[in-house]
């Protein structure tokens, strides 16, 4: 084993960690569990304990990112560098970053949890044998109802264990139809659809109607994603395999390496490769998040690489199902922290432990039996509203900070950022925010802590906006942007990723500009921004005073409220209304007195 120069280590034993964001490759519960198990390897042999927290002052901050992701060590796309970690210390020291251009799994292919069947929700086992053939993705073979299923062991023929894969024919998510499956074909805006669609949405989410006519019934749900058959590379990256598909006149109902000399599995993304030539690579075994995390956490605790090839801290990834820690790893970590203390002898307990609840029984039966139950669904909203997302990571009621005069929004001279979110005005300042609903005698509520509702964010924000269709929240601070969908966060990402050059130091505001489009402001300049593509059109760059004559040129925040544009400078705002394509200043006022209706005392 090797330790870092000067035996860098944590000087306390109760280590905290924060999972800042997630990969889409695995269910969140699986990611949480992989990290917890990885920490448990190290706590089992040392006096260290690991506690999950939900704030950035955790010792170890865990983040998924791609390419340039906010430190000086960019990731390199798929394969190669899988993750990296910093040695113990304050700030970014001790943090662990995982390359989200990898396929994260548990080392044996994509993790696809099943429903119903007879496997108690176990994940698919890829590849699996059915009727003597090998399958590397869910299949509809053996069924007449088109429901995709998989075996949860290596051999369905011998073990008979199966479950149904995520499928819109089985259930939908969120939406307003209680999780009912899609109804195909269905009518939307007078047109007939026989598959999930993104039509009518600007955020790329696939949805369907759960009755034959959306126009009449307005019932819909979002289609589950199928990690097992989402292709990479080829000419259809991100699309789904279509089974069966025709290749050189022959039908394939699973991924194949036919026609390739390198043995890599591929599939067509339409039913006929011969005519459409659309294809991509099928997911590979992926990298075990558990094993890679265990290795990275070794670095985060102070271990350098080992020269022992069997050790977890050896610098090459190797999938193993055995105990990951080698004696060399144990010796190394104990060199830094000592062994785990022997537990105190304890008298036998006299209370009878409560039995855990029995597992709920899923409908059973072989793959030819249609499941008899339907899952329940999440929050509602029309197709244009987007998935509302799970609750925020913080407390269920936002923490109110003890009040002092500066905590009264009416005493704030200049807010960092203001945004209309939902039907309320949110006002941000120094790690806090207030909410305001217009009405006679209403006052701003708060302050609340930004970190409780949006834990990934910095204290100081430059601007915030909500994209109404997808309910995505964009938070800008300096050269970085965070995008929240419910409680899940993408970021921080650099402004370069939005197509804004290095000369753009910050985004000072945003206004809606048509369906799925925004105007982004930075000082005297503005750009048209496509929310779905998350990219500005570089050719759209314009001077603010050309489009909005009469507003100050040194505004520090631009926001939209009640369909009007507000340009803030110092304590004042310039309100702009649009009439027949003309933008005209129709009011100048104080943010506190005129918008928040603060008393003028």
């Amino acid at each position: 084993f090797q330790t870092f120069e000067g035996d860098l280590k944590w000087h306390h034993h109760n280590i905290t960690y924060w999972i800042q964001n997630y990969s889409e490759d695995l269910p969140r519960a699986v990611i949480d569990d992989a990290f917890a198990r990885a920490f448990a390897l190290w706590s089992a042999v040392t006096p260290l304990t690991f506690t999950r927290v939900y704030s950035r002052d955790a010792d170890i901050v865990i983040q998924f990112g791609v390419a340039e992701h906010g430190d000086g060590y960019p990731f390199d796309g798929k394969d190669g560098l899988l993750a990296h970690a910093f040695p113990p210390g304050p700030g970014i020291q001790g943090d662990a970053h995982f390359d989200d251009d990898e396929l994260w799994s548990l080392g044996k292919g994509v993790v696809v949890p099943t429903r119903f069947g007879n496997a108690d929700g176990a994940a698919c086992h890829f590849p699996f044998i059915f009727e003597g053939r090998s399958y590397s993705a869910c299949t509809t073979d053996g069924r007449s109802d088109g429901l995709p299923w998989c075996s949860t062991t290596a051999n369905y023929d011998t073990d008979d264990r199966f479950g149904f894969c995520p499928s819109e024919r089985l259930y939908t998510q969120d939406g307003n139809a209680d999780g009912k499956p899609c109804q195909f074909p269905f009518i939307f805006q007078g047109q007939s659809y026989s598959a999930c669609t993104t039509d009518g949405r600007s955020d790329g989410y696939r949805w369907c109607a759960t009755t034959a006519n959306y126009d009449r019934d307005k019932l819909f749900g979002f289609c589950p994603t199928r990690a097992d058959s989402t292709v990479m590379g080829g000419n259809s990256a991100g699309e789904l395999c279509v089974f069966p598909f025709t290749f050189l006149g022959k039908e394939y109902s699973t991924c194949t390496s036919e026609g390739r000399g390198d043995g890599r599995l591929w599939c067509a993304t339409t039913s006929n490769f011969d005519s459409d030539k659309k294809w991509g690579f099928c997911p590979d075994q992926g990298y075990s998040l558990f094993l890679v995390a265990a290795h990275e956490f070794g670095h985060a605790l102070g271990l350098d690489h080992s020269s022992v090839p069997e050790a977890l801290m050896y610098p090459m990834y190797r999938f193993t199902e055995g105990p990951p820690l080698h004696k060399d790893d144990v010796n190394g970590i104990r060199h830094l922290y000592g062994p785990r203390p022997e537990p105190e002898p304890r008298p036998p307990t006299t209370t009878t432990p409560q039995p855990t609840a029995p597992p709920t029984v899923c409908p059973t039966g072989p793959p030819t039996v249609h499941p008899s139950e339907r899952p329940t669904a999440g929050p509602t909203g029309p197709p244009s509203a987007g998935p509302t997302g799970p609750p925020t990571a913080g407390p269920s009621t936002a923490t109110t900070v003890p009040l002092s005069p500066v905590d009264d929004a009416c005493n704030v001279n200049i807010f960092d950022a203001i945004a209309e979110i939902g039907n309320q005005l949110y006002l941000f300042k120094d790690g806090k925010y207030w909410r305001f609903s217009e009405g006679r005698g209403s006052r701003p509520q708060g302050p609340f802590l930004i970190a409780d509702k949006w834990p990934a964010l910095p204290r100081k924000l430059d601007s915030v906006f909500e994209e109404r269709l997808s309910k995505k929240l964009f938070f800008f601070s300096g050269r970085q942007v965070w995008v929240y969908t419910g409680a899940s966060v993408l970021g921080p990402r650099r402004l370069d990723k939005l197509g804004l050059g290095a000369d753009v130091a910050q985004v000072t505001g945003a206004l809606r500009s048509g369906r799925g489009k925004m105007l982004l402001f930075s000082g005297r300049r503005l750009w048209r921004f496509d929310v779905k593509a998350q990219m500005v059109d570089p050719r759209s760059a314009s001077e603010v005073d050309r489009m909005f004559p009469g507003v100050p040129l040194d505004t520090h925040d631009v926001f939209q409220y009640r369909e009007k544009a507000y340009f803030c400078q110092d304590r004042f705002y310039w309100r702009v209304s649009s009439r027949s394509e003309l933008n005209q200043v129709d009011q100048v006022g104080y943010v506190t007195y005129d918008i928040l209706q603060c008393p003028e005392d």
């Epitope: 796309g77 394969d79 560098l81 910093f86 040695p87 610098p315």
Partner: antibody, heavy 124, light 107 residues
Framework: EVQLLESGGGLVQPGGSLRLSCAAS???????SMWWVRQAPGKGLEWVS?????????FYADSVKGRFTISRDNSKNTLYLQMNSLRAEDTAVYYC?????????????????WGQGTLVTVSS | DIQMTQSPATLSLSPGERATLSCRAS??????LAWYQQKPGQAPRLLIY???YRATGIPARFSGSGSGTDFTLTISSLEPEDYAVYYC?????????FGQGTRLEIK
């Protein structure tokens, strides 16, 4: 003893091309990221490009993007920089440098070994 | 990109004196800072990495300190061979950037 030896510099006309090489010895070349850093006459240091240990990832300074290509041959312990569409402002001493950090352990920021440099002059 | 500003541009001191060179980053870079020494006609030489760790073979009179945005290179007692140009370099954020250099000359 770690050694880095650059070659391939010289006088070239604007729009021309040159290929620089850097022969490495004394360390496990295939484990480390390698960099090209340049220094215009009488000026400071400017990073040009980096290639990760496996050669699977390359990054470039904005000033050379699209014109320069970094590559490596781990079997020959050699780093390369192919320079096309050269401009007068590319005139500099070009150094290859070894990263102190390696693989997934990040920290130990710094370039612990440098070559002696090779002069590239772009002039008509 | 993060701007690295070194001061002073030139420092004139006599042998035996203490030299203090400053490097300031335009935003926090944690401790991801290195110092290099460059003599005329030679390649740069790593002195300090991660703000405060002396590189192999560097005399104990060289020390580095600081974190976040403000960093210092100190030479406790100048030797004749220490007169050179000194550069700081950050890797707290991508891309890496160098300071413009401080020339240390004999008074």
């Amino acid at each position: 003893e770690v050694q880095l030896l650059e070659s391939g510099g010289g006088l070239v006309q604007p729009g021309g091309s040159l290929r620089l090489s850097c022969a490495a010895s004394g360390f496990t070349f295939s484990q480390y990221s390698m960099w090209w850093v340049r220094q215009a006459p009488g000026k400071g240091l400017e990073w040009v490009s980096v290639i990760y240990s496996s050669g699977g990832a390359t990054f470039y300074a904005d000033s050379v993007k699209g014109r320069f290509t970094i590559s490596r041959d781990n079997s020959k312990n050699t780093l390369y920089l192919q320079m096309n569409s050269l401009r007068a402002e590319d005139t500099a001493v070009y150094y290859c440098a070894k990263d102190r950090a390696y693989g997934d352990y990040v920290g130990w920021n710094g370039f612990d070994y440098w070559g002696q440099g090779t002069l590239v002059t772009v002039s008509s | 990109d993060i701007q690295m500003t070194q001061s002073p541009a030139t420092l004139s001191l006599s042998p035996g004196e203490r030299a203090t060179l400053s490097c300031r980053a335009s935003q926090s870079i944690s401790s991801f800072l290195a110092w290099y020494q460059q003599k005329p006609g030679q390649a740069p030489r790593l002195l300090i990495y991660d703000a405060s760790y002396r590189a192999t073979g560097i005399p104990a009179r060289f020390s580095g300190s600081g974190s976040g945005t403000d960093f210092t290179l100190t030479i406790s007692s100048l030797e004749p061979e220490d007169y050179a140009v000194y550069y700081c370099q950050q890797r707290g954020n991508w891309p890496i950037t160098f300071g413009q250099g401080t020339r240390l000359e004999i008074k």
